[in-house]
């Protein structure tokens, strides 16, 4: 039950996170005109990954797309790439995780397969979240650098007689949406990975399984838990019967070289 809840919650959190990453990527307000300690302009500038906008005092907003690909800064291209990779990975992760959900029955899919899919989607969510956080952070760093550069030469002109208003940009709403969304996707991914561990049956190395030797002497082999990645392994803990070498759900255990006394 706890596993199902963890998996379900991980899925929902990741879904919200990926929706947020998509929203942030599409938003125009990645950077907004800094109004602090600046002349109050009747027009307000803000920029996104795909276009820049100007809102005039009448309320009218005019946006222009970046119709060039080669003329754009490499950093902006990198941010775009990171966000798109994050969205693509997240979307694939969502698709995989839908089939991996314990509450959804698809044919006779093994628990081990669901565990694998859960882990796969979890990893995808983690990478997706990291991509989004990285993309937003790179853009934020770019803004901070440009902000201090434009502050250094806030007013330029001939002999100080003619002044040029330097439009400085600060963090826009999209950055905060991106950070939160990336974090949620990351958390969702971690939850999926945790859920994966509880989904798959443990590989049994004759853990506390008794062997009846000839005569009355019985040899016991206390076994440890085998570390598992979750891929292809049965990581479910088994209830052991005293009488034989088979577990409750009749999974055959094969003896290893250490099993004989």
């Amino acid at each position: 039950m706890a596993v199902t809840a963890c998996q379900g919650l991980g899925f929902v959190v990741s879904l919200i996170g990926i929706a947020g990453i998509i929203a942030a990527t599409c938003m125009d307000q990645w950077s907004t005109q800094d109004l602090y300690n600046n002349p109050v302009t009747a027009v307000f500038n803000y920029q996104g990954l795909w276009r820049s906008c100007v809102r005039e005092s009448s309320g009218f907003t005019e946006c222009r797309g970046y119709f060039t690909l080669l003329g754009l800064p490499a950093m902006l291209q990198a941010v775009r790439a990171l966000m798109i990779v994050g969205i693509v990975l997240g979307a694939i992760g969502l698709l995989v995780s839908i089939f991996a959900l314990k509450c959804i029955r698809i044919g006779s899919m093994e628990d081990s397969a669901k565990a694998n899919m859960t882990l796969t989607s979890g990893i995808m969510f983690i990478v997706s979240g990291l991509c989004a956080i990285a993309g937003v952070s790179v853009f934020a760093n770019m803004l901070v650098t440009n902000f201090w550069m434009s502050t250094a030469n806030m007013y330029t002109g001939m002999g100080g007689m003619v002044q040029t208003v330097q439009t400085r940009y600060t963090f826009g709403a999209a950055l905060f949406v991106g950070w939160v969304a990336g974090g949620l996707t990351l958390i969702g991914g971690v939850m999926m990975c945790i859920a994966c561990r509880g989904l798959a049956p443990e590989e049994t190395n004759y853990k506390a399984v008794s062997y009846h030797a000839s005569g009355h002497s019985v040899a016991y082999k206390p076994g440890g838990f085998k570390a598992s990645t979750g891929f292809g392994s049965n990581t479910k803990n088994k209830k052991i019967y005293d009488g034989g070498a088979r577990t409750e759900d009749e999974v055959q255990s094969y003896p290893s070289k250490h099993d004989y006394v």
């Epitope: 005109q33 002349p39 109050v40 302009t41 009747a42 027009v43 500038n45 803000y46 920029q47 820049s52 906008c53 100007v54 005039e56 005092s57 009448s58 309320g59 009218f60 005019e62 222009r64 003619v162 002044q163 040029t164 208003v165 439009t167």
Partner: antibody, heavy 120, light 113 residues
């Protein structure tokens, strides 16, 4: 058609207040901000402030803060300008104008002006 | 506040003549966001309210004759009347439409010979 109708001229005593109106016709009142200007006789124009009926946002020229007050009556599509503590310097023609939404980004329609004379 | 300086303050012309008047601002009126200059030109005939001629430095308002042309960028702007007509006798104001408070130039008065 678009029209801004301003109230008639006023003759007022120093220290008093005057409230003039600017009534809008022929367009959606809430879409366009209304700007107010002052023009001393035979001189240039000074921007007093503006009012956006859409969100009730008001901006003032620092010079006129405390002197001028903009109010609105949306039901009658009217913006009011009240000038208080009048002195002879306030004798002028006061214009209201509509700032266009989109193109042109400018004051495209003006009222006929309200002449205010401050005299004892 | 931005100071708008117009020159000359008055201009005496003859019909059909080409007229150029200047407007300088103390700060740039160019918005980096859209590369537009927020400068407006108005015409005020005697006893009338101002009338919009040119917005964003060079865009002609609809209904304004093609003989009126606005040009310039940053801090230096020009209004040109290619062939002056009698009805053009008026005072011409340039206005900063970019930084609050909006400010107007002192005006250029156009007079006929």
């Amino acid at each position: 058609q678009v029209q801004l109708q301003q109230s008639g001229g006023e003759l007022v005593k120093p220290g008093a207040s005057v409230k003039m109106s600017c009534k809008a016709f022929g367009y959606t009142f809430t879409t366009y901000p209304i700007e107010w200007m002052k023009q001393n006789h035979g001189k240039s124009l000074e921007w007093i402030g503006n009012f956006h009926p859409y969100n009730d946002d008001t901006k003032y020229n620092e010079k006129f803060k405390g002197k001028a007050k903009l109010t609105v009556e949306k039901s009658s599509s009217t913006v009011y300008l009240e000038v208080s503590r009048l002195t002879s310097d306030d004798s002028a023609v006061y214009y209201c104008a509509r700032r266009a939404y989109g193109y042109p980004y400018a004051m495209d329609y003006w009222g006929q002006g309200t002449s205010v004379t401050v005299s004892s | 506040d931005i100071v708008m300086t117009q020159s000359p303050s008055s201009l005496t012309v003859t019909a059909g003549e080409k007229v150029t008047m200047s407007c300088k601002s103390s700060q740039s009126l160019l918005n980096s966001g859209n590369q537009k200059n927020y400068l407006t030109w108005y015409q005020q005939r005697p006893g009338q309210p101002p009338k919009l001629l040119i917005y964003r430095a060079s865009s002609r308002e609809s209904g304004v004759p093609v003989r009126f042309t606005g040009s310039g960028s940053g801090t230096d702007f020009t209004l040109t009347i290619s062939s002056v007509q009698a009805e053009d006798l008026a005072v011409y104001y340039c206005q900063n439409d970019y930084i609050y408070p909006y400010t107007f130039g002192g005006g250029t008065k156009l007079e006929m010979n």
